[in-house]
Interface confidence: medium
């Protein structure tokens, strides 16, 4: 049950519990939206985002999107509700404590996305083979 103090002082829509009934509270995520990045040909990268933001809703998770085209590389860091698609993709890995990048099919660019549910977990984005074995050929290309 929710203590009387919390019931009185917090909006009801902010009281979210996990499957065990524990209070689920808003996460802290890196939240710089889209920024140019130098992250390329690395097993992992730091976001270099200086903004740590409190997500608006308790159910939101941290998301990072890495995109490379002929002109530039960008890294997007946001909070997002995993029940809703992001960039037309479902956040399949939202429960992960780490942000493990997975490639998504997007015409004209290389597009990786990850989501995770620990504080500031989208600060460190991981492309490494030890976590991502879904497309080993692609990883060979990335790390050559």
């Amino acid at each position: 049950t929710i203590p009387p103090h919390v019931q009185k002082s917090v909006n009801n829509d902010m009281i979210v519990t996990d499957n065990n009934g524990a209070v689920k509270f808003p996460q802290l995520c890196k939240f710089c939206d889209v920024r140019f990045s130098t992250c390329d040909n690395q097993k992992s990268c730091m976001s270099n985002c200086s903004i740590t933001s409190i997500c608006e809703k308790p159910q939101e998770v941290c998301v990072a999107v890495w995109r490379k085209n002929d002109e530039n590389i960008t890294l997007e860091t946001v909070c997002h509700d995993p029940k809703l698609p992001y960039h037309d993709f479902i956040l399949e890995d939202a429960a992960s404590p780490k942000c493990i990048m997975k490639e998504k099919k997007k015409p004209g660019e290389t597009f990786f996305m990850c989501s995770c549910s620990s504080d500031e977990c989208n600060d460190n984005i991981i492309f490494s083979e030890e976590y991502n074995t879904s497309n080993p050929d692609l990883l060979l290309v990335i790390f050559q």
Epitope: P3, V6, V23, I54, P58
Partner: antibody
Framework: QLQVQESGPGLVKPSETLSLTCTVS??????????WSWIRQPPGKGLEWIGS???????YYNPSLKSRATISIDTSKNQFSLKLSSVTAADTAVYYC?????????????WGQGTLVTVSS | EIVLTQSPATLSLSPGERATLSCRAS??????LAWYQQKPGQAPRLLIY???NRATGIPARFSGSGSGTDFTLTISSLEPEDFAVYYC?????????FGQGTKVEIK
């Protein structure tokens, strides 16, 4: 009614480490409903957030303190503590320990009475 | 970090008058702004959180409004116990930061 109260030395010498303890009464410090913070206020000035300990073990600090601050929790004693290393006169302040609801992170709804710490030789 | 600027620094009013305090953020803090009251020798007391929500036990004469970068705390009719320093505080980005305070004094 859950309450917090600070304790510790009122005088610390420059370059030494300031150590304060906050005792939580009327409830468990392990509750998932609350986070625990330290905030300070130099005499006649405004408030500065030092850091917070959130349920699940994550601790956040104000980057302005340049890694000098350490917040730790002792669940067996229902206490949490602050250590601030390499203090200078600029660290002279009233130090408050405080509690906030985890569902509205970053808001303080219960404060200790505050303890004045003077840094002087 | 986000800088909060409060105005005026001092507000001189009489009991029964309306007080309007302003807080401006250096960048958007969404609706994540709180107001605290502090009397001499005491700890701050939470009045309003998330721009417009009154904390438990706070009288209805205290109200908050605003979003983004501009926020207002209004005390509809000042009571003698309302003369104090008022701080705004954002929780949108880490670290949470406070304004420098507005002193409401008896005219």
């Amino acid at each position: 009614q859950l309450q917090v109260q600070e304790s510790g030395p009122g005088l610390v010498k420059p370059s030494e480490t300031l150590s304060l303890t906050c005792t939580v009464s009327g409830g468990s410090i392990s509750s998932s409903y609350f986070s625990w913070s330290w905030i300070r206020q130099p005499p006649g000035k405004g408030l500065e957030w030092i850091g917070s300990f959130y349920y699940g073990g994550k601790t956040y600090y104000n980057p302005s303190l340049k890694s000098r601050a350490t917040i730790s929790i002792d669940t067996s004693k229902n206490q949490f503590s602050l250590k601030l290393s390499s203090v200078t006169a600029a660290d002279t302040a009233v130090y408050y320990c405080a509690r906030g609801p985890t569902t509205i992170r970053g808001v303080i709804d219960s404060w200790g009475q505050g303890t004045l710490v003077t840094v002087s030789s | 970090e986000i800088v909060l600027t409060q105005s005026p620094a001092t507000l001189s009013l009489s009991p029964g008058e309306r007080a309007t305090l302003s807080c401006r953020a250096s960048q958007s803090v969404r609706s994540y702004l709180a107001w605290y009251q502090q009397k001499p020798g005491q700890a701050p007391r939470l009045l309003i959180y998330d721009a417009s929500n009154r904390a438990t036990g706070i009288p209805a004469r205290f109200s908050g409004s605003g979003s983004g970068t501009d926020f207002t705390l209004t005390i509809s009719s000042l009571e003698p116990e309302d003369f104090a320093v008022y701080y705004c505080q954002q929780r949108s980005n880490w670290p949470p930061t406070f304004g420098q305070g507005t002193k409401v004094e008896i005219k």
